[in-house]
């Protein structure tokens, strides 16, 4: 078992003439999200197979509104990694499909409209447990930069996550701080622990303590983006040494629309009117419909027979997400009390209790006074399955091991001095005040304040 992780670094217009300025065009604000699909093997047939290794959908990105006359930016992206858990062995060779979806937020009949903006498909070889692999892919007019890796979930280890790790004490070739695992000594206990604080998104390590940054990031924790040159050109090939873009030909020159699409210019960009069955700013991708089987884990697909309409997945119990790709995390509600470990077994939840606790939700405290040592003359009190120490005067804490200064809470009001005494504390009040805690002003009839420190008392620090 393990997790495939994909980090999208940027998605935006690719270089060259006719690059789009906005994913939204004239349709008003929109936002992006990504879908990743993993298929085992490298064969051509894999292209049409379902996402047998798994799939995941990102969160929606920030809302993007086209800024007239502004340069085409990298588009605002959803936060976080896309994670695709796999239960069985990692195949090593696989097909990676990344789809960029657009959600239009303008005044749509029937709610937001989805359309597939770009799709990249790449066949890859990748060993689990290795460093992040970096890639840049173009899909029509768009450019996608991303990194990915596969990692095993302990106790599984190895390049295919097929070996279970059992620490061995013999010396090994695993490197500093890592022990080998049975059954084969060339399997190591776990990937290296990176430098504390190393960015999970932008950093990785191959040796313990390292924090090596992915391209575009720097700093001790890979948290600082490398600054890029600020260019104001909108499109066209680079013609200066600064790397900035200068204006190129008109947006519809050479008809950028594929598959028989027709091009029309928009301010600073273009728009393709695609024939039936095609999507994307350049009509370069075919639409996803229910026939493509986009719903996972037995989800029921509704609508979307027509490529122009979005599909909806109705998920079975225990799954959620737009494509039913996410298992509902019932442990996130933290049902296990007293530090118990929650296990979602699918058919039921189980709590693995810490020592001293029991019950379906670890709600029963098994400890009793028999095993509880209350120090410094404290006495153990039981009640309702729980226990506590009732501490002698001057002591506190769970086991009465901490010395309690009765004056620490500054109990004497109005500038009174606090004196610790074997029987508790005594307040010596400032002139004009009286009472056990100096809480009462002396009345005009002349009742005097308490005297200075009574004999036999140890002065504490005067209160200020």
């Amino acid at each position: 078992a393990g997790v495939f992780e994909l980090q999208i670094h940027s998605f935006g217009p690719g270089p060259g003439p006719g690059a789009p300025r906005s994913p939204c065009s004239a349709r008003g604000p929109c936002r992006l999200f990504f879908r990743v699909c993993l298929k085992p093997g490298l064969s051509e047939e894999a292209a049409e197979s379902p996402c047998a290794l798994g799939a995941a959908l990102s969160a929606r990105g920030p809302v993007y509104t086209e800024q007239p006359e502004a340069p085409a930016p990298d588009l605002p992206l959803p936060n976080g990694l896309l994670q695709v858990p796999f239960r069985d062995a990692w195949p090593g060779t696989f097909s990676l499909i990344i789809e960029t979806w657009r959600e239009e937020l303008g005044d749509q009949i029937g709610g937001p409209a989805w359309s597939l903006l770009a799709r990249v498909t790449r066949r890859r070889r990748l060993a689990a447990g290795g460093p992040w692999a970096r890639d840049i892919q173009r899909a029509g007019a768009w450019e996608l930069r991303f990194s990915y890796r596969a990692r095993c979930e302990l106790p599984a280890v190895g390049t295919a996550c097929t070996r279970l790790c059992r620490p061995r004490s013999a010396p090994s070739r695993c490197g500093p701080g890592l022990r080998p695992c049975a059954p084969l000594e060339d399997e190591c206990e776990a990937p290296p622990v990176c430098r504390a604080g190393c960015s999970l998104e932008h950093g990785f390590c191959e040796q313990p303590g390292e924090c090596r940054c992915l391209e575009g990031w720097t700093g001790p924790l890979c948290m600082v983006p490398v600054s890029t040159s600020s260019c104001l050109g909108l499109r066209g090939p680079s013609s200066t040494t600064t790397g900035c873009l200068v204006p190129g030909p008109g947006p519809c020159d050479g008809n950028p629309c594929a598959n028989g699409g027709s091009c029309s210019e928009t301010p600073g960009s273009f728009e393709c009117t695609c024939p039936r069955g095609f999507y994307g700013l350049r009509c370069e991708v075919s639409g996803v419909t229910c026939a493509d089987g986009p719903c996972f884990n037995g989800g029921l697909c509704v609508g979307g027979a027509d490529p122009d309409s979005a599909y909806i997945c109705h998920c079975p119990p225990g799954f959620q997400g737009s494509n039913c790709e996410k298992r509902v995390d019932r442990c996130s509600l933290q049902p296990c009390r007293n530090g118990g470990l929650c296990l979602d077994l699918g058919h039921a939840l189980r709590c693995r209790c810490r020592a001293g606790f029991a019950g379906p939700r670890c709600e029963h405290d098994l400890d009793d006074c028999a095993g509880r040592a209350c120090a410094n003359g404290g006495t153990c009190v039981e009640g309702g399955g729980a226990h506590r120490c009732s501490c002698a005067l001057g002591f506190g804490g769970r086991n009465c091991r901490e010395r309690a200064d009765p004056c620490a809470a500054r109990p004497c009001a109005h500038g009174g001095r606090c004196y610790a005494h074997f029987s508790g504390l005594v307040c010596a009040c400032a002139p004009g005040y009286m009472g056990a805690r100096c809480e009462f002003p002396v009345h005009p009839d002349g009742v005097s304040a308490l005297p200075a420190a009574p004999p036999g008392l140890r002065p504490g620090d005067p209160q200020r």
């Epitope: 490197g175 500093p176 701080g177 290296p192 622990v193 430098r195 504390a196 604080g197 040796q207 313990p208 303590g209 390292e210 720097t218 700093g219 001790p220 924790l221 948290m223 600082v224």
Partner: antibody, heavy 119, light 107 residues
């Protein structure tokens, strides 16, 4: 218990070189960065740089490039900083510290080595 | 380089009082600021890291807050052993840089 034990006071002449040491005990030396910090009266603390003993990777403050050189010997759990072409400006207390295993900061410091450069 | 401006540089207080020390970064350093205590004859001690996380073994009267460019160390109900020099340090980018220090003295 983690400890960083630094070498003793050094009195050097201008133009000379000196090698300060920092011996680590109580943890796996190779997996944590060792940091070097300079302290001069009126100048506060200055970060010189760091070394990861397991790989020999180093990061230097540009200001100290050419002045400081870091090395580490995992067999003796000791990190070293060599300071070359000494001047009176190099007179200071030099600290080594450990970047934590789970803490994003320096969780243990050495006691410091006082270097005096005087003719 | 990220400049760290620490204020005040000198502070006099009495036991039981609450004090605050501030550090301001010349640009955003996210949450990556730590606070250290320096006392004569002792090794420097880490108090707070990642802006607000209390290091293990440090009394709860110490607390840190802030992110981005402005950070604060607060010591509530000062104890006699708290009189020392305090430094902040940013870990977000190279070179790592320290504040100028705050000397906390007994009034």
């Amino acid at each position: 218990q983690v400890q960083l034990q630094q070498s003793g006071t050094e009195l050097m002449k201008p133009g000379a070189s000196v090698k300060l040491s920092c011996k680590a005990t109580g943890y796996t030396f190779t997996g944590n960065w060792i940091e070097w910090v300079k302290q001069r009266p009126g100048h506060g603390l200055e970060w010189i740089g760091e070394i990861l003993p397991g790989t020999g990777s180093t990061q230097y403050n540009e200001k100290f490039k050419g002045k400081a050189t870091f090395t580490a010997d995992p067999s003796s759990n000791t990190a070293y900083m060599q300071l070359s072409s000494l001047t009176t400006e190099d007179s200071a207390i030099y600290y080594c510290a450990r970047w934590g295993s789970t803490v994003v900061a320096y969780d243990y410091w050495g006691q410091g080595t006082t270097l005096t450069v005087s003719s | 380089d990220v400049q760290i401006t620490q204020s005040p540089s000198y502070l006099a207080a009495s036991p039981g009082e609450t004090i605050t020390i501030n550090c301001r970064a010349s640009k955003s350093i996210s949450k990556y600021l730590a606070w250290y205590q320096e006392k004569p004859g002792k090794t420097n001690k880490l108090l707070i890291y990642s802006g607000s996380t209390l290091h293990s073994g440090i009394p709860s009267r110490f607390s840190g807050s802030g992110s981005g460019t402005d950070f604060t160390l607060t010591i509530s109900s000062l104890e006699p052993e708290d009189f020392a020099i305090y430094y902040c340090q940013q870990h977000n980018e190279y070179p790592l840089t320290f504040g100028g220090g705050t000397k906390l003295e007994l009034k």
